[in-house]
């Protein structure tokens, strides 16, 4: 169970970081 929650924590953070970076790039181009 701890392994599952650790995986989810990493996946959530990585997904958030990706989305935030995409937004940053879009706003700098726009």
């Amino acid at each position: 169970m701890a392994m599952v929650s650790e995986f989810l924590k990493q996946a959530w953070f990585i997904e958030n970081e990706e989305q935030e970076y995409v937004q940053t790039v879009k706003s700098s181009k726009g």
Epitope: K9, I14, E17, Y21, V22
Partner: antibody
Framework: EVQLLESGGGLVQPGGSLRLSCAAS????????MSWVRQAPGKGLEWVSA????????YYADSVKGRFTISRDNSKNTLYLQMNSLRAEDTAVYYC?????????WGQGTLVTVSS | QSVLTQPPSASGTPGQRVTISCTGS????????VTWYQQLPGTAPKLLIY???HRPSGVPDRFSGSKSGTSASLAISGLQSEDEADYYC???????????FGGGTKLTVLG
């Protein structure tokens, strides 16, 4: 302008310790995960460690686990890497980089030489 | 031995198209996005491609990335002498709870 400036490298004997610092400016440091990446002379890149924005999660490469400690002081906009029990194979240029896995900004690096 | 596998070297002449491969597994490339970095001689690495195929602002559209399953590729078209550099792929690995790099590919522009 985003800037990352590493310091603290130098020559150290095997078994010794060193603390690297990375001073960040030009962005809201406390909002970002930060990482350390190293490169041995003439070799490829090796990820060393990463820390979440608030310091709540920390990750290490197996090669440094139990010997290196990453930390950050968000009030000083500074990232640290405490390196203990240093070995010859830790000799490398150490870079700090912004983010956990899209390293969009890198410092210029600081050279750590482990030799007797 | 790197977790992600890249050819150690690649070469091409000016104007040519060159591709660099990066092979991983289900715990890294298979489940996470791939990033590519360019390292010019004597300098720090620079972000080249993120999220498998996206270019940051300032990176020429001659550089493109793609991914299929557990492998990724970097393509450079219209090769120029200033493209001579080391190229690294990277991805987060869920099994290792660590970021992993490929061993790097040294690109030589001939002639």
């Amino acid at each position: 302008e985003v800037q990352l400036l590493e310091s603290g490298g130098g020559l150290v004997q095997p078994g010794g310790s060193l603390r690297l610092s990375c001073a960040a400016s030009g962005f809201t440091f406390s909002n970002y995960a930060m990482s350390w990446v190293r490169q041995a002379p003439g070799k490829g890149l090796e990820w060393v460690s990463a820390i979440y924005p608030g310091g709540g999660s920390i990750y290490y490469a197996d090669s440094v686990k139990g010997r290196f400690t990453i930390s950050r002081d968000n009030s000083k906009n500074t990232l640290y890497l405490q390196m203990n029990s240093l070995r010859a194979e830790d000799t490398a240029v150490y870079y700090c980089a912004r983010r956990l896995q899209i390293f969009d900004y890198w410092g210029q690096g600081t050279l750590v030489t482990v030799s007797s | 031995q790197s977790v992600l596998t890249q050819p150690p070297s690649a070469s091409g002449t000016p104007g040519q198209r060159v591709t660099i491969s990066c092979t991983g597994s289900s715990s890294n490339i298979g489940s996470n996005n791939v990033t590519w970095y360019q390292q010019l001689p004597g300098t720090a690495p620079k972000l080249l491609i993120y999220s498998d195929s996206h270019r940051p602002s300032g990176v020429p559209d001659r550089f493109s990335g793609s991914k299929s399953g557990t492998s990724a590729s970097l393509a450079i078209s219209g090769l120029q002498s200033e493209d001579e550099a080391d190229y690294y792929c990277g991805s987060w690995d869920y099994s290792l709870s660590a970021y992993v790099f490929g061993g790097g590919t040294k690109l030589t522009v001939l002639g």
